[in-house]
């Protein structure tokens, strides 16, 4: 005999949780449902769109001898290396008979230390010749404030108070190193150190 009385109510007994973490994090979202009769295929949605190439696995177990008895179904969606493109609202969707059921939503968010999109590059310059260096970083969380350092000495009193994405250097008379620090609410990330070699005059 069926283990649950059935009504036109969502068959979901478990909904996706929330995942918030830094880039590269691995996590699993799950949906759980108990249905009478043939178990449905579980589809995953992100921001309302079906994920065609989702890394999901579905486990289904009959709870009785008769195929019209209840089945338990667990679908697991694996996020192997969290990226900005993975963020959004996740739901499970099933078609049962002539009805569509959608789970309650879970959310995937990215939050961690700043991530560099651009870092200062090594270069060779003529003495006392102006040049620019670039540095760009993003969160979340935003805002991300930059602090430039020359030979490990900060060029501003605090992050965000000096030059940001582009540092204009009016000229150098000796080889120097430059780096930039990206600060957000989660902490600080330091870029690579660029060596600016000054050619003798």
């Amino acid at each position: 005999a069926p283990r649950g009385t059935q009504a036109e109510e969502s068959p979901f007994v478990g909904n996706p949780g929330n995942i918030t973490g830094a880039r590269g994090l691995t996590g699993t979202l799950r949906c759980q449902l108990q249905v009478q009769g043939e178990p449905p295929e579980v589809h995953w949605l992100r921001d309302g769109q079906i994920l065609e190439l989702a890394d999901s696995t579905q486990t289904q177990v009959p709870l009785g001898e008769d195929e019209q008895d209840d089945w338990i179904v667990v679908s697991q969606l694996r996020i192997t290396s969290l990226q900005l493109s993975d963020t959004g609202q996740y739901q499970c969707l099933v078609f049962l008979g002539h009805q569509t059921f959608v789970s309650q939503p879970g959310y995937v968010g990215l939050e961690g230390l700043p991530y560099f999109l651009e870092e200062p590059e090594d270069r060779t310059v003529a003495a006392n010749t102006p040049f620019n260096l670039s540095c760009q970083a993003q969160g979340p969380p935003e805002p991300v404030d930059l602090l430039w350092l020359q030979d490990a000495v900060p060029l501003a009193t605090a992050p965000g108070h000096g030059p940001q994405r582009s540092l204009h250097v009016p000229g150098l008379n000796k080889t120097s190193s430059f780096s930039c620090e990206a600060h957000n609410a989660k902490g600080v990330t330091t870029s690579r150190t660029a060596t600016i070699t000054v050619l003798p005059q």
Epitope: G4, E9, V13, G17, Q32, V74
Partner: antibody
């Protein structure tokens, strides 16, 4: 703050009936599956019954099926367990528990319990 | 019916120790395992669900792990307030079933 308060327990004779209530506050009651779990004197926990948020799906332990009915009144934020044909082996502390959002078959908040003693 | 077996009725530990409480399911429950803590005179409190997801407000010294049929709850840096009964439960399917409990006590 999630709060669950059971009432309705007592001492009854075998074959009698009893109705437990659980008043919920601090959350949107209709969004959560709810369960009754009992604990016997030997400290063992035994699941009794569960009900979906809207009340349309119910699940029972085999040896209470046909004797116990789980129900809910969402407008009153109240969960019920109607128990009939009570047996001495039903003697236990009955807890009302909220199902976790990620799986309402896992219970994330429990009441303090209501004692049921079935004895001749 | 899925049987949850907690092989140790009692486990002795010392403050600051690391202890693992184990639970075995009679069939694969696809990580649908919860862990509860119960102190004398109190109702059970959820610690872990889906084998490794910590419930809100649970200290990170409590860690759940496992898959298939074998699961464990590890408490690192045991505190005196951790001395209690611990129960595993499968939340894979009805009938929902609990282990018999493990009492964590001081050596």
């Amino acid at each position: 703050e999630v709060n669950l308060v059971e009432s309705g327990g007592g001492v009854v004779k075998p074959g009698a009936s009893l109705k437990l209530s659980c008043e919920a506050s601090g959350f949107t009651f209709s969004n959560y599956g709810m369960s009754w779990v009992r604990q016997t004197s030997d400290k063992r926990l035994e699941w009794v019954a569960s009900i979906s948020g809207g009340g349309g799906r119910t699940y029972y332990l085999d040896n209470v099926k046909g004797r116990f009915i789980i129900s809910r009144e969402n407008a009153k934020n109240t969960l019920y367990l109607q128990m009939s044909s009570l047996k001495s082996e039903d003697t236990a502390l009955f807890y009302c528990a909220r199902g976790a959002r990620a799986s309402y078959f896992a219970m994330d908040y429990w009441g303090q319990g209501s004692s049921v003693t079935v004895s001749s | 019916v899925i049987v949850m077996t907690q092989s140790h009725k009692f486990m002795s530990t010392s403050v600051g120790d690391r202890v693992s409480i184990t639970c075995k399911a009679s069939q694969d429950v696809t990580t649908a395992v919860a862990w509860y803590q119960q102190k004398p005179g109190q109702s059970p409190k959820l610690l872990i669900y889906w084998a490794s997801t910590r419930h809100t407000g649970v200290p990170d010294r409590f860690t759940g792990s496992g898959s298939g049929t074998d699961y464990s709850l590890t408490i690192s840096n045991v505190q005196t307030e951790d001395l209690a009964f611990y129960y595993c439960q499968q939340h894979f399917t009805t009938p929902l079933t609990f282990g018999a409990g493990t009492k964590l006590e001081l050596k």
